[in-house]
């Protein structure tokens, strides 16, 4: 398994990840956002809510 060198993002990227932690993937020359639970998107900009629907009467 190839090792990936990571570090924190520079201050230059402050605000890049809207709802998550910014990680600098050194060998890949890119920033990556590790999103908080409930958020998705390249920059953790989308909120998604998983709604559990109650069972319908027909099913019961």
């Amino acid at each position: 398994v190839a090792q990936v060198s990571i570090t924190k993002c520079s201050s230059d990227m402050n605000g890049y990840c809207l709802h998550g932690q910014c990680i600098y993937l050194v060998d890949m020359s890119q920033n990556y956002c590790r999103c908080e639970v409930g958020y998705t998107g390249v920059r953790c900009e989308h909120f998604f809510l998983t709604v559990h629907q109650p069972l319908s009467k027909e099913y019961v």
Partner: antibody, heavy 116, light 106 residues
Framework: QDQLVQSGAEVKKPGASVKVSCKAS????????IQWVRQAPGQGLEWMGR????????KYVPKFQGRVTITADTSTNTAYMELSSLRSEDTAVYYC?????????WGQGTLVTVSS | DIQMTQSPSSLSASVGDRVTITCKAS??????IAWYQQKPGQAPRLLIQ???TLQEGVPSRFSGSGSGTDYTFTISSLQPEDIATYYC????????FGGGTKVEIK
């Protein structure tokens, strides 16, 4: 493949404004920051500022503050740099540069000539 | 604003020579420095980022080192195709380029 295609060369008179466009393809500019860099003939590289296309937030070098406006249109995946009150010293190649998802991916450059 | 002082502004060396360029930051930039090569009429080409990480396809004769405020870019054995101007760029806090170093063959 990812590309940043800039608008063509411009010739402007002193005191006028210029607006350079930078159209992205192969990626969404909302996933990136778009920086602008310029280079006068025979001179070094000079960072001007940047925009976060996701929210429109901008940062400018104090030297250009008040004279430069960087904008982005996410519907067309295009960023713009407008420089006003042009003077001869603004004659330069202007580059847009993508950063964020990939470290510093450059456009081909746009030559702006300021001459009376 | 962070200032980047690059030296020398120009140098002349023979093919096969070891060439060293330095950049000094006005404050700690936490290794967030990149090095570019620019040939006349071309856009800059990224060689190294995060002090020492060589980009794909860049020859191993190019290297970088440093920490804190002091950084070095080295060409271990100068080749004719290395004739260009080299720039450092700090990206720790916004961005600032060094003044550039023009490398010529003796």
């Amino acid at each position: 493949q990812d590309q940043l295609v800039q608008s063509g060369a411009e010739v402007k008179k002193p005191g006028a404004s210029v607006k350079v466009s930078c159209k992205a393809s192969g990626f969404n500019i909302k996933d990136t920051y778009i920086q602008w860099v310029r280079q006068a003939p025979g001179q070094g590289l000079e960072w001007m500022g940047r925009i976060d296309p996701l929210n429109g937030n901008t940062k400018y070098v104090p030297k250009f503050q008040g004279r430069v406006t960087i904008t982005a249109d996410t519907s067309t995946n295009t960023a713009y740099m407008e420089l006003s009150s042009l003077r001869s010293e603004d004659t330069a190649v202007y580059y847009c540069v993508r950063s964020g998802t990939l470290f510093d991916f450059w456009g081909q450059g746009t030559l702006v000539t300021v001459s009376s | 604003d962070i200032q980047m002082t690059q030296s020398p502004s120009s140098l002349s060396a023979s093919v096969g020579d070891r060439v060293t360029i330095t950049c000094k930051a006005s404050q700690d930039i936490h290794k967030y420095i990149a090095w570019y090569q620019q040939k006349p009429g071309q856009a800059p080409r990224l060689l190294i980022q995060y002090t020492s990480t060589l980009q794909e396809g860049v020859p191993s004769r190019f290297s970088g080192s440093g920490s804190g405020t002091d950084y070095t870019f080295t060409i271990s054995s100068l080749q004719p195709e290395d004739i260009a101007t080299y720039y450092c760029l700090q990206y720790d806090n916004l961005r600032t380029f060094g003044g550039g170093t023009k490398v010529e063959i003796k």
